[in-house]
């Protein structure tokens, strides 16, 4: 029951983390002008991955896109390339990751099958939610440098009578969105793991009951005379007796527990 | 059509407040910027300060202490209230509404006022 | 604050002539985000309200006469009426729309000879 329900939480974690990186990854106001210490302008500049955009105070708002892609800096293509791929490995992860929920049954999946899709979408969704935390983390690196950059020179004079307005730019929502959105798919793909770890069979508690006959370390198989060691690895059953209880998927899935010698 | 139509007291005392309504019909308040702009007689045109379709104000930095900006959207009106008036203030004072690039693309015809005791 | 200056404060013309008026800002009313200079250009009759001519420094309001051209970036701005007729005779002002106050230049007299 915990495995399942650390399996769904991890599920639904990981859709929101994803939904919110494709949002920050869509969203226009990735860096917004600074208005602290800048003179009082009647328009406000906000930039995207995609687009950049200028509000005027009169409540006009016009959108320019970035209709180059060698013009434009190597470290923004790079948060790009980052949010994207974190986009793509997200949805992967979730596709593998519905069919893997022990919810959801689909045939006679093995619990085994199931086990190996949860840890799939599990490294998926971490990989994903750290190639969102990386691109908006490398963008604001690029603004915090840019930043002082312009402090240094916010006012470039004109033969010292004329002043330009530097515009300077601060984090915007689609950072922080983004942030919260990889952190979400990290913990999300996390609990995927830790359900798979629950999920997987247990290699540990029994693996055959061998009867040791005299000088002799053989266990003896009924229904056959393939002999072989008692704790060796057996590729087709890794589980063979466990001991305990078991589900009726469990029941189906592997060898009866009267399979020992 | 677009119209603005600004109404005022016309004469006021020296040191007394004045209220000056600007009544807009075929556009929304919500939707546009509206500015006060004053002309004294025989010179030029001086900004006084705007309420945005937002409801934020922004004054000339000379008259902030002394002006106020409102309006009430349901009634389509928008208000400039003056303080401590002086004979300086004589104007033809006008209501315009902006757009494209914070500009005023619609006038209103003004009302005159006279400071004078 | 911002300073608008106009030049020259009156200009004498014939009909058909070229004019050309300035108008000088003390900070740059150049926006890097969209590229667009917030400079706006009015005409005022005597008796009526402004009329809006020219927003953007360049882009033309609806309805004006294509002879009215405006140019410039940054600090130093032109409106050019490439062929004056009896009806331009007005003053012309230029606004600053970028950073507050949004204060006008003294204005640019156009009278005929």
């Known amino acids: 029951m915990a495995v399942t329900a650390c399996q769904g939480l991890g599920f639904v974690v990981s859709l929101i983390g994803i939904a919110g990186i494709i949002a920050a990854t869509c969203m226009d106001q990735w860096s917004t002008q600074d208005l602290y210490n800048n003179p009082v302008t009647a328009v406000f500049n906000y930039q995207g991955l995609w687009r950049s955009c200028v509000r005027e105070s009169s409540g006009f708002t016009e959108c320019r896109g970035y209709f180059t892609l060698l013009g434009l800096p190597a470290m923004l293509q790079a948060v790009r390339a980052l949010m994207i791929v974190g986009i793509v490995l997200g949805a992967i992860g979730l596709l593998v990751s519905i069919f893997a929920l022990k919810c959801i049954r689909i045939g006679s999946m093995e619990d085994s099958a199931k086990a190996n899709m949860t840890l799939t979408s599990g490294i998926m969704f971490i990989v994903s939610g750290l190639c969102a935390i990386a691109g908006v983390s490398v963008f604001a690196n690029m603004l915090v440098t840019n930043f002082w950059m312009s402090t240094a020179n916010m006012y470039t004079g004109m033969g010292g009578m004329v002043q330009t307005v530097q515009t300077r730019y601060t984090f915007g929502a689609a950072l922080f969105v983004g942030w919260v959105a990889g952190g979400l798919t990290l913990i999300g793909g996390v609990m995927m793991c830790i359900a798979c770890r629950g999920l997987a069979p247990e290699e540990t508690n029994y693996k055959a009951v061998s009867y040791h006959a005299s000088g002799h370390s053989v266990a003896y198989k009924p229904g056959g005379f393939k002999a072989s060691t008692g704790f060796g690895s057996n590729t087709k059953n890794k589980k063979i007796y466990d001991g305990g209880a078991r589900t009726e998927d469990e029941v189906q899935s592997y060898p009866s527990k009267h399979d020992y010698v | 059509q677009v119209q603005l139509k600004e109404s005022g007291p016309g004469l006021v005392a020296p040191s007394q407040s004045l209220s000056i309504t600007c009544t807009v019909s075929g556009f929304s308040l919500t939707s546009y910027g509206a500015h006060w702009v004053r002309q004294p007689p025989g010179k030029g045109l001086e900004w006084l300060g705007v309420i945005w379709a937002g409801g934020s104000t922004n004054y000339d930095s000379a008259l902030m202490s002394r002006l106020s900006i409102s309006k009430d959207r349901s009634k389509s009106q928008v208000f400039l209230k003056m303080t401590s008036l002086q004979t300086d203030d004589t104007a033809m004072y006008y209501c315009?509404?902006?757009?494209?690039?914070?500009?005023?693309?619609?006038w209103g015809q003004g009302t005159t006022l006279t400071v004078s005791s | 604050d911002i300073v608008m200056t106009q030049s020259p404060s009156s200009l004498t013309v014939t009909a058909g002539e070229k004019v050309t008026m300035s108008c000088k800002s003390s900070?740059?009313?150049?926006?890097?985000?969209?590229?667009?200079?917030?400079l706006t250009w009015y005409q005022q009759k005597p008796g009526q309200p402004p009329k809006l001519l020219i927003y953007w420094a360049s882009t033309r309001e609806s309805g004006v006469p294509d002879r009215f051209t405006g140019s410039g970036s940054g600090t130093d701005f032109t409106l050019t009426i490439s062929s004056v007729q009896a009806e331009d005779l007005a003053v012309y002002y230029c606004?600053?729309?970028?950073?507050?106050?949004?204060?006008f230049g003294a204005g640019t007299k156009l009278e005929l000879k």
């Open positions: 315009a509404r902006s757009l494209y690039g914070n500009s005023f693309d619609h």
């Open positions: 900070q740059s009313l150049f926006n890097s985000g969209n590229q667009k200079n917030y």
């Open positions: 606004q600053n729309n970028y950073i507050y106050p949004l204060a």
